[in-house]
Interface confidence: low
């Protein structure tokens, strides 16, 4: 028999957690699991419960997490890694749209994230999307060009800035920018 299937690991309500705010990490395997093991990678921290409740997010808790479970004498494959990010560590950047936040369908727009710090990484979030735009060509730049805008691009955007030296310590989110596609 092969290895036990990997569990899922999620952060509720989100893996982007403002400093001093609560978050719950939940490892979910099949019914009847004997033991869960939730670990913070690159550290000696682990626990033998499926749920980790963090009442107030700290810088030291940011990082990569993973979990496994045990049935009988077998360990499961590890879950996909979860990246828990502390936000609000640095001042918020500003987000603007060029040439402007109102754009015709089929046109081009560039969302620009600016910060007074020397950060080399930026993340752009659209409200309602589960993850940031992490395409490599966008991820490391302060500008996020959207070519051939469609109605699906309408919505509220925020950006974060951070350093590759501390990739899980992010700024506060920018003020929201409403992109209107006409």
């Amino acid at each position: 028999s092969g290895p036990l299937p990997k569990p899922s690991l999620q952060a509720l309500p989100s893996s982007l957690v403002p400093l001093e705010k609560p978050v719950t990490l939940r490892c979910q395997g099949p019914p009847g699991v004997d033991l869960y093991r939730l670990e913070k990678l690159s550290s000696s921290r682990y626990q033998d419960q499926a749920v980790l409740f963090i009442p107030a997010m700290k810088r030291s808790l940011a990082g990569r997490y993973r979990c496994s479970y045990q049935n009988g004498s077998l360990w499961s494959l590890p879950s996909d890694q979860l990246e828990l990010v502390a936000t609000g560590v640095f001042a918020k950047p500003s987000l603007s749209a060029q040439p402007g936040p109102a754009v015709s369908s089929g046109g081009d727009v560039t969302l620009q994230c600016q910060t007074r710090y020397g950060f080399d990484q930026f993340a752009l979030y659209k409200e309602g999307d589960p993850a940031p735009y992490k395409n490599p060509e966008r991820w490391y730049r302060a500008s996020f060009p959207i070519i051939t805008v469609t109605a699906a691009h309408s919505g509220t955007y925020r950006c974060y800035s951070f350093s590759s030296r501390d990739p899980y310590l992010w700024s506060a989110p920018s003020d929201p920018l409403e992109l209107v596609v006409t």
Partner: nanobody
């Protein structure tokens, strides 16, 4: 390499008690958790209890309140105190050490003792 040696098994009446011991030798510095497993005839080996280096414990639901696992880090030994034994506790009991590598997930070691027989019968 790690060697594990169990002792303390035997025949006991229902409601009785036994104390199992497991001694680890060899590369014990890499051991994180130690645990007990059991295998009844015709069944798969199952988890019973475990204890971390720091003393955190976990138990199989059916033994909670009856079995107590403890550990002596200085002696590299782990113990299983079994009270209120039931016929369904009859099995060969095995000791295992958990390793926490610097990278990769937690895993059970490939090292098992020879096991110690526990028989609960009147």
């Amino acid at each position: 390499q790690v060697q594990l040696q169990e002792s303390g098994g035997g025949l006991v009446q229902p409601g009785g008690s036994l104390r199992l011991a497991c001694a680890a030798s060899g590369s014990v510095s890499s051991i994180n958790d130690m645990g007990w497993y059991r295998q009844a005839p015709g069944k798969q080996r199952e988890f019973v209890a475990r204890i971390s280096r720091g003393g955190l414990t976990n138990y199989k639901d059916s033994v909670k309140g009856r079995f107590t696992i403890s550990r002596d880090n200085a002696k590299n030994q782990v113990y299983l105190q079994m009270n209120s034994l039931k016929p369904e506790d009859t099995a060969v009991y095995y000791c295992n050490a958990d390793f926490r590598p610097s990278s990769g997930t937690f895993r059970l070691s490939d090292y098992w003792g020879q096991g110690t027989q526990v028989t609960v019968s009147s």
